[in-house]
């Protein structure tokens, strides 16, 4: 069923783009017939096109009526600069180019799978790493912190580079870099734990280049619902890669009889994927799918980009909402398996764990659920948004808000159900995570709508930085700290071990509700910010003298 939905969504997206092309051809014909006096049909940001009447914009998810910016044919009217030479004037692209774009998106998604596979392979063999290097829990925390911090610091740098230099070269170099570092780290001797820490930091830098730049290439290859679909596929790579990482880690370790080999799988695949990116991913111009390929000559400074992003309310609120998602997923991913194990101890269906790993079975089940709900969430979110776009222009942030608020309810119910039924708790986790993950691709799409193409990599980077800083960089530790604080004020018993962690985890649904509020705030400004982005893109398409970004 899901596969059918995906197929129909893909087909629908392709049909929609074909229809767009046909509409553009008709408009050009009408304009030529009218002696060229009408406003030209160039597409704006995310595919904005102006009808002959001048009051309807073909946006990414439908059409918006607007007041004309000037009488038809007025010099400087947005969209008129590229009547003859712009992509809008070109003949329809051959089918092979569509296939090429599909292949490029597939390779980029595969790269994202490997990004997360690599990250979670280490998580899958973390206990073996701890055992081998004699790493204490604080040392394991250091490995995680160094990775996230280096990722956070590197993301804005790659955002800057991604908006200014050849993106596929940066992508490939990033993959080659983290592949080489991960492969090398499998040979680190027992006494050099600090080298392992350094290697995780370097991998964080390599992976930041990918996570920051790859979505912007997809944004430049597709528009409208096709872009939503492709971003959905790209972001589905997160749970898929994470799940495969755990599986790869444990299965390779068992097959080879040595955990070191687990760290040698993703680098080999990474090198292949990096090469494929160089070969198959076209060197798209920023704004290419938005029909602005050759026109985006204007370059703004990084400082101006940052100011523009901070003033972009839809971007700011959606970034804060993403941080809330990150906070919850980080905390739940770390603590839920142990919480469920403690629940079973209280229910007398499991023994108190004195020798870690505690809740290994629960970790496995939770990992499988996360993998599946990631897929289901992305598909559901994309499908719901696609349907809601027919009803409202604010569909994207509203679907996200509903998903978040619904998720908060089910996350709350986890703690109610866990007291009496582990199966009930797993059902709540399933529904809660599906709803929580439904906004992954949509959030990326929101960013594509409200941020101009030449700023997208910086925007993705800043959002990534924010979501890690306010989200999963601190949430696992905060939950552990609160749990310990509660436990210190109560008597030492399995019941209070369970309850204290449960009470601490109750912070998650509150943060998720806050995230839902941020998405509702995004909905308030979404239409105006999107229109502003389209207008700015049209201004960027004009001669430099008239550019005001």
């Amino acid at each position: 069923m899901m596969c059918l939905e995906c197929a129909s969504a893909a087909a629908g997206g392709a049909e929609e783009e074909e229809a767009d092309a046909e509409r553009r051809r008709r408009r050009r014909g009408a304009q030529r017939g009218a002696g060229g006096s009408g406003c030209c049909g160039a597409r704006g940001a995310g595919g904005a096109g102006v009808s002959a009447a001048g009051d309807e914009v073909q946006t990414l998810s439908g059409s918006v009526r607007r007041a004309p910016t000037g009488p038809p044919g007025t010099p400087g009217t947005p969209g008129c600069a590229a009547t003859a030479k712009g992509p809008g004037a070109q003949q329809p692209k051959p089918a092979s180019l569509g296939r090429g774009r599909g292949a490029a998106a597939a390779i980029l998604s595969l790269g994202n799978v490997l990004n997360y596979l690599d990250r979670y392979t280490v998580a899958g063999v973390l206990l073996d790493i701890q055992q081998h290097f004699g790493v204490k829990d604080r040392g394991a925390g250091l490995l995680q912190s160094v990775f996230i911090c280096s990722f956070m610091v590197a993301a804005p740098i790659f955002g800057y580079l991604g908006d200014r230099f050849n993106r596929k070269v940066i992508l490939s170099c990033g993959i080659f870099f983290w592949s080489a570092v991960t492969f090398s780290s499998s040979f680190i001797a027992q006494q050099y734990f600090w080298l392992l820490v350094l290697s995780r930091g370097l991998v964080g830098i390599g992976e930041a280049s990918y996570s920051t730049i790859a979505p912007t290439i997809i944004g430049d290859l597709f528009t409208k619902n096709t872009r939503t679909l492709m971003l959905s596929v790209f972001y589905f790579a997160i749970p898929l890669g994470s799940g495969l990482g755990y599986i790869t880690g444990s299965s390779v370790k068992q097959a080879a009889g040595d955990w070191h080999w687990a760290l040698r799988v993703s680098p080999v695949l990474g090198m292949i994927t990096g090469t494929l990116i160089l070969i198959l991913v076209p060197a798209t111009k920023r704004g290419h799918a938005d029909q602005l390929g050759d026109q985006l000559k204007a370059r703004t400074s990084w400082l101006r980009d940052m100011k523009a992003l901070i003033r972009n309310r839809s971007y700011v609120f959606s970034s804060l909402a993403t941080s809330a998602v990150s906070f919850a997923t980080g905390a739940l991913g770390m603590w839920i398996p142990l919480y469920l194990h403690r629940a079973q101890v209280v229910q007398k269906t499991a023994e108190t764990c004195n020798s870690p790993p505690c809740g290994a079975k629960d970790s496995l089940i939770f990992g499988a659920i996360t993998c599946f709900t990631g897929f289901l969430g992305v598909v559901t979110g994309a499908g719901a948004t696609r349907w809601c776009r027919l009803k409202t222009q604010r569909a994207d942030p509203l679907v996200c808000a509903v998903g978040m608020l619904g998720s908060a309810i089910f996350i709350c119910l986890i703690f109610v159900a866990a007291k009496s039924s582990i199966v009930g708790a797993y059902i709540c986790i399933f529904v809660g995570e599906t709803l929580l993950f439904s906004n992954w691709a949509i959030t990326a799409d929101i960013l594509m709508y409200v941020v101009i193409p030449t700023r997208r990599a910086t925007a993705v980077a800043l959002q990534s930085f924010t979501s890690h800083l306010l989200g999963d960089a601190g949430s696992p530790y905060l939950i552990g700290f609160i749990s310990d604080l509660i436990r210190q004020s109560t008597k030492d018993s399995p019941l209070w071990e369970f309850l204290s962690l449960g009470y601490a985890l109750m912070l998650c649904p509150f943060v998720v509700v806050l995230g839902g509020m941020f998405f509702l705030a995004t909905a308030l400004f979404f239409v105006s910010d999107r229109a502003r982005a389209e207008q700015q893109v049209n201004q960027l398409a004009m001669p430099p003298a008239s550019v005001k970004v």
Epitope: Q130, G134, V135, G139, Q191
Partner: antibody, heavy 125, light 107 residues
């Protein structure tokens, strides 16, 4: 100065129990991994058990030959490590050394940088 | 379990000579090998860690080398206090294991 002093050894009958104690001083005990190593008369060294610090959930590891019979534990407030030996056998006769693992805050070495003077345990009927 | 084999079991030398003691692992263990000296009626003491890293307070005549499966403890110009039993220990994986020892005696 690092000091490790073992007590609690003696002569016991097969099948009986004995608890060894190791008092420590001169270092931050709560952050340090501790082990017991034994040496049968005229034989080589054999690692018995390891207990990690509280930052590693006080995880314990045992040699296969004593698993299920011996239990290692620690009391951070007293800076002591213990070895509870149950169902003792003749082949458990040995000098038992309390050992310290070198600590590096984030991680620990599995080798033994300090050894106690040892305590003799004799299992005989 | 990783098995360590030490050779020779006994080595007879005269003071002032230089000697090499061998330790072989049943599988590759990188540099996770450590050397201990146990004098008669004394507790063991750590000489070398991680195959070649020296220990504070240990005379510089003791040195270690090797990687993978073959390791060497070298004593440059043996002194009278060096006549004792030498053990290698692996920490590559649990359980921690020791070699059977090499006894260094006066020729």
């Amino acid at each position: 100065e690092v000091q490790l002093v073992e007590t609690g050894g003696g002569l016991v009958r097969p099948g009986s129990s004995l608890k060894l104690s190791c008092a420590t001083s001169g270092f931050t005990f709560s952050d340090t991994w501790m082990s017991w190593v034994r040496q049968a008369p005229g034989k080589g060294l054999e690692w018995v058990a390891l207990i990690k610090d509280k930052n590693s959930n006080s995880e314990a590891n045992y040699a296969e030959s004593i698993k299920g019979r011996f239990t290692i534990s620690r009391d951070d407030s007293k800076s002591r490590v213990y070895l509870q030996m149950n169902t003792l056998r003749d082949q458990d006769t040995a000098t038992y050394y309390c050992t310290r693992h070198e600590d590096f805050y984030y991680y620990s070495g599995y080798y033994f940088d300090y050894w106690g003077q040892g305590v003799m345990v004799t299992v005989s009927s | 379990d990783i098995v360590l084999t030490q050779s020779p079991p006994t080595l007879s030398v005269t003071p002032g000579e230089s000697v090499s003691l061998s330790c072989r692992a049943s599988q590759g263990i990188s540099t996770s090998i450590h050397w201990y000296q146990q004098r008669s009626n004394e507790s063991p003491r750590l000489l070398i860690k991680y195959a070649s890293q020296s220990i504070a307070g240990i005379p510089s005549r003791f040195s270690g080398s090797g990687s993978g499966t073959d390791f060497i403890l070298s004593i440059n110009r043996v002194e009278s206090e060096d006549f004792s039993v030498y053990y290698c220990q692996q920490t590559y994986s649990l359980p921690l294991t020791f070699g059977p020892g090499t006894k260094l005696e006066v020729k």
